[in-house]
Interface confidence: low
C-alpha cells in the first residue's frame, strides 16, 4: 500500500508564520489518570490500569518540542515478575513482567530548503520511534 | 507547551503531485511477529508477547488510506479473565483481562482550499484516535 512523503510548506500557503508553535488547544497525549507517585511493585485494587496490573508500570515523560507528538510516555516496569492476584504484593517468578514495544509514527520539524538552497520554512520528517507502551505479565519462553 | 497547526502544501513546494501517495519504503507499522492465527484463550510458552501474555490478545487491522498511519492495529482480548501461569490454559476469575487504551496522534488527508475557495492540494488534519494497545491482567476494582 502507499505511503505519504514529508510535508513541507512553501512561502505560499500556509505561511511560515503559521508553522511556528501555535497554541491550538489539543488534549494532552498523556495516559489517562497518569500518576507518577505512589508507584511500587504491587498491584492496587483501585486507580488506573497501570497500577492495578499484576505487571505494574510507571510512565516516564519523553518531551521533544521539535517532534510531533511533543510528549511521549514510556512505560517502565516496576517488577521483574508478576504480582500475586491474591495479595497484590508478593511475586511469582514463574511469570515475567515484560515491556510491550511499539514503533510509533512521529514527525520531526526540520528546516526546509528551496531549490536554491534558501530556507523555506519547516518540513515534517516522518520517522518510526520506539516506545514502550505497557508491561505485560507473560509466561517465560521455553527454549526448545 | 506549544502545539503545531495543520500542515498544508501550496502550489509551490512540495507540488500537489508529490502529495499523492508515494512509494517511499517505510517499515510497516504492525506489531512485531504479528500472528492472526492460532489464537485462543491460553498463554503460550513461545511466540510473540501477545500470545505469551496471561491476558492474551489478537490484533485487528484498521486501515484507512486517508490517514497517517494508514494501518493501525487494535488489540482484542481473547479471555475475560487472566490465564493461569501454572497451566497456561484455565482462567482465574480473580483477575480481569482489560484493554489498555491510548489516544494516538494521527493525521487525516483533507482537501485544502485557497483564499478564493479553490482547491489547493491536501492538508494534514491532526486528530486524536483511540486505539487499544494490549490486554493487561489486572486486579478488579474494589468499589469503596
Amino acid at each position: 500500500y502507499s505511503h505519504w512523503p514529508s510535508c513541507c510548506p512553501s512561502k505560499g500557503y500556509p505561511s511560515e508564520e503559521l508553522l511556528r508553535w501555535s497554541t491550538v488547544p489539543v488534549p494532552p497525549l498523556k495516559p489517562a489518570s497518569l500518576d507518577f507517585h505512589s508507584v511500587s511493585c504491587r498491584a492496587s485494587e483501585d486507580g488506573p490500569l497501570n497500577s492495578r496490573a499484576i505487571s505494574p508500570w510507571r510512565y516516564e515523560l519523553d518531551r521533544d518540542l521539535n517532534r510531533l507528538p511533543q510528549d511521549l510516555y514510556h512505560a517502565r516496569c516496576l517488577c521483574p515478575h508478576c504480582v500475586s492476584l491474591q495479595t497484590g504484593s508478593h511475586m511469582d517468578p514463574r511469570g515475567n513482567s515484560e515491556l510491550l514495544y511499539h514503533n510509533q509514527t512521529v514527525f520531526y520539524r526540520r528546516p526546509c530548503h528551496g531549490k536554491k538552497g534558501n530556507h523555506k520554512g519547516y518540513c515534517l520528517e516522518r520517522r518510526l520511534y520506539r516506545v514502550s507502551l505497557a508491561c505485560v505479565c507473560v509466561r517465560p519462553r521455553v527454549m526448545g | 507547551y506549544s502545539h503545531w497547526p495543520s500542515c498544508c502544501p501550496s502550489k509551490g513546494y512540495p507540488s500537489e503531485e508529490l502529495l499523492r501517495w508515494s512509494t517511499v519504503p517505510v517499515p510497516p507499522l504492525k506489531p512485531a511477529s504479528l500472528d492472526f492465527h492460532s489464537v485462543s484463550c491460553r498463554a503460550s510458552e513461545d511466540g510473540p508477547l501477545n500470545s505469551r501474555a496471561i491476558s492474551p490478545w489478537r490484533y485487528e487491522l484498521d486501515r484507512d488510506l486517508n490517514r497517517l498511519p494508514q494501518d493501525l492495529y487494535h488489540a482484542r482480548c481473547l479471555c475475560p479473565h487472566c490465564v493461569s501461569l501454572q497451566t497456561g490454559s484455565h482462567m482465574d476469575p480473580r483477575g480481569n483481562s482489560e484493554l489498555l487504551y491510548h489516544n494516538q496522534t494521527v493525521f487525516y488527508r483533507r482537501p485544502c482550499h485557497g483564499k478564493k475557495g479553490n482547491h489547493k492540494g491536501y492538508c494534514l488534519e491532526r486528530r486524536l484516535y483511540r486505539v487499544s494497545l494490549a490486554c493487561v491482567c489486572v486486579r478488579p476494582r474494589v468499589m469503596g
Epitope: Q86, D92 | C82, R94
Partner: antibody, heavy 121, light 113 residues
C-alpha cells in the same frame, strides 16, 4: 515438579512442643502461601493455619495460643511449632501449598504425604 | 467460624452411575463483587493426602477428569461424579476459604455398590 516433605519426631510427650518441618523441593518457596492441616486418626481435616509473604500468618483460633508457623527461605523450609501438646493433638500433619500464586490462598493444590505424630508419655 | 456440613455421610453407587455429594456452609461464601464462591472440593484416598478437585465451587483443577463437576452458589454446593469409576472410591471433603479459619466439611465416603 514441586514436592513437599514433612519431617519431625513421630512421638512427642504431653506438654512438650511439637516441631515439624516441611521441605520444599523442585520449586520456589517464595511467592506462595503455605498451610498446615492435620487429620486425627479416622477423622476429618482440620486447618491449622497458613503463612504468606514469608511473614503474614493466619491461625485457627482454636489453636492460636499454641501455634507458630514460620518460613526459612534460605533452607526452603516451612515450620510448624505447637506448644503444650496433649493426646488430642495426635494426628497426621500435612503441609500444603496454594495451587498457584494467583489463586485464593485457601484452595490447596500441592500437598505433602503427611507425617504421623503421636502424643503419648 | 463458618461451619461446613456434608450429606450424605456415605453413599454407594454402581459403576458408571452418577454420584452426588452435597455441602452446606453456615454462612454465605459468595463474594458478589467478583461473583466467586470461595469453596473447594478435595478427594482423599486411603493412606494418601487430599487432592484438590474443584475450586471456586465449579472450576475443575488441571488434570482432573471431566466426570467431576462442581455447582452451587452462596451456601449450597454439590459435587457430582457423572459416571463413577473404581478409582473414585474415596472420601470427599468440601472446604470454604471465604474467611479464616478455613474450614472443611466432615467428609462423604463414596463406595461402589
Amino acid at each position: 515438579q514441586v514436592q513437599l516433605q514433612e519431617s519431625g519426631p513421630g512421638l512427642v510427650k504431653p506438654s512438650e512442643t511439637l516441631s515439624l518441618t516441611c521441605t520444599v523441593s523442585g520449586g520456589s518457596i517464595n511467592s506462595y502461601s503455605w498451610t498446615w492441616i492435620r487429620q486425627p486418626p479416622g477423622k476429618g481435616l482440620e486447618w491449622i493455619g497458613n503463612i504468606y509473604n514469608s511473614e503474614n500468618t493466619n491461625y485457627n483460633p482454636s489453636l492460636k495460643s499454641r501455634v507458630t508457623i514460620s518460613v526459612d527461605t534460605s533452607k526452603s523450609q516451612v515450620s510448624l511449632k505447637l506448644n503444650s501438646v496433649t493426646a488430642a493433638d495426635t494426628a497426621v500433619y500435612y503441609c500444603a501449598r496454594t495451587y498457584n500464586w494467583n489463586y485464593e490462598i485457601g484452595a490447596m493444590g500441592v500437598w505433602g504425604q503427611g507425617t504421623t505424630v503421636t502424643v503419648s508419655s | 467460624d463458618i461451619v461446613m456440613t456434608q450429606f450424605p455421610d456415605s453413599l454407594a453407587v454402581s459403576l458408571g452411575e452418577r454420584a452426588t455429594i452435597n455441602c452446606k456452609s453456615s454462612q454465605n461464601v459468595l463474594i458478589t463483587s467478583n461473583n466467586k464462591n470461595y469453596l473447594a472440593w478435595y478427594q482423599q484416598k486411603p493412606g494418601q493426602p487430599p487432592k484438590l478437585l474443584i475450586y471456586w465451587a465449579s472450576t475443575r483443577e488441571f488434570g482432573v477428569p471431566a466426570r467431576f463437576s462442581g455447582s452451587g452458589s452462596g451456601t449450597d454446593f454439590t459435587l457430582t461424579i457423572s459416571s463413577l469409576q473404581a478409582e473414585d472410591v474415596a472420601v470427599y471433603y468440601c472446604q470454604q476459604y471465604y474467611s479464616t479459619p478455613f474450614t472443611f466439611g466432615p467428609g462423604t465416603k463414596v463406595d461402589i455398590k
